[in-house]
């Protein structure tokens, strides 16, 4: 039995983090951090289920190096969520994510992935 | 309301084989990644093995690898483990539980929030 | 692999605070997720993430990170709060495992 996934690539602004090289390099404590925030995060927005997780995580440097950008794959199981929705749920979350997590997020975009998507896939 | 029902315990002897089963309900099943985690007499949890949403990624401790087999049947919401060649220190009570995540896709763990009520194993001659 | 580890015994007067900490190198990736086990039932997840509670765990419960430490903090230690905890997270050098800390018991006095 074949389970269909859908992928959503998200890009969003952290723009009360200043990026550094560390945030190329995964094995630095910035970058496990921010990462680890972020995973979370979206197992706290996406929680009312069909939310696979998320791959491909890319940490930029925004306008002037001022900010950080992320950029991401989501997952879900097909049929449980379309972009709107996964657009419109992390909106809503921004306030939530700058108590718990101190991220002050800006500038969402969210888009479909066109099929045929790899994404890395963990281990369980 | 969310629960793992386990079954499929027993005495057997080293050498032997038992299977478990765990059957869930009250979640989308297929949503989440599972595990089985055991708890020797007096001792304290020990994870055994996990299994991915889609079964895609499966992991085992060392201790187990090569004699015990996890599987899940999404169908049927149950989550299973063989076990094989069994020694007298894999005598233990074992659990199953939900993990929080799906298990795959940046596979970051975060815990397991449900669990069932446990289920022995005794290994004995 | 890799281990984490638990003081085996803490203690704690009633009403007061209490930290059970758990130490790993797998902790600098992962956050832990603390588990309270009382004798002869299945483990409970108390805190999971950089300090999430699963819905009808109380608030006197709260988890943080520093570094390859996470530590589970009790404020106001009530006497049902007397169990076995044990921490947890993934294995940071081997990707597809789990691991659990030995255990703390907690006290109640």
């Known amino acids: 039995l074949s389970t269909g996934v859908s992928f959503f690539f998200l890009s969003f602004h952290i723009s009360n983090l200043q990026f550094n090289s560390s945030l190329e390099d995964p094995s630095t404590d910035y970058y496990q951090e921010l990462q680890r925030d972020i995973s979370e995060m979206f197992l706290q927005i996406y929680k009312q289920g069909g939310f696979l997780g998320l791959s491909n995580i890319k940490f930029r440097p925004g306008g002037g190096g001022g900010s950080v950008v992320v950029q991401l794959t989501l997952a879900f199981r097909e049929g449980t969520i379309n972009v709107h929705d996964v657009e419109t749920q992390f909106n809503q979350y921004k306030t939530e994510a700058a108590s718990r997590y101190n991220l002050t997020i800006s500038d969402v975009s969210v888009s479909d992935v066109p099929f045929p998507f790899s994404a890395q896939s963990g281990a369980g | 309301q969310v629960q793992l029902v386990q079954s499929g315990g027993g005495l057997v002897q080293p050498g032997g084989s038992l299977r478990l089963s765990c059957a869930a309900s009250g979640f989308t099943f297929d949503d989440y990644a599972m595990h089985w985690v055991r708890q020797a007499p007096g001792k304290g949890l020990e994870w055994v093995s996990g299994?991915?949403?889609?079964?895609?990624?499966?992991g085992y401790a060392d201790s187990v690898k090569g004699r015990f087999t996890i599987s899940r049947d999404n169908a049927k919401n149950s989550l299973y483990l063989q076990m094989n060649s069994l020694r007298a220190e894999d005598t233990a009570l074992y659990y199953c539980?939900?993990?929080?995540?799906?298990?795959?896709?940046?596979?970051?763990?975060?815990?397991?929030?449900?669990w069932g009520q446990g289920t022995t194993a005794t290994i004995s001659s | 692999s890799s281990e984490l580890t638990q003081d085996p015994a803490v203690s704690v007067a009633l009403g007061q605070t209490v930290r059970i900490t758990c130490q790993g190198d797998?902790?600098?990736?992962?956050?832990a997720s603390w588990y309270q086990q009382k004798p002869g039932q299945a483990p409970v997840l108390v805190i999971y993430g950089k300090n999430s509670r699963p819905s009808g765990i109380p608030d006197r419960f709260s988890g943080s990170n520093s570094g390859s430490t996470a530590s589970l903090t009790i404020t106001g230690a009530q006497a049902e709060d007397e169990a076995d905890y044990y921490c947890n997270s993934r294995d940071r050098y081997g990707n597809s495992l789990v691991i659990f800390g030995g255990g703390t018991k907690l006290t109640v006095l």
């Open positions: 797998s902790l600098r990736s992962y956050y």
């Open positions: 539980a939900k993990d929080i995540g799906s298990g795959s896709y940046y596979n970051y763990y975060y815990g397991m929030d449900v």
């Open positions: 299994i991915s949403w889609n079964s895609g990624s499966i």
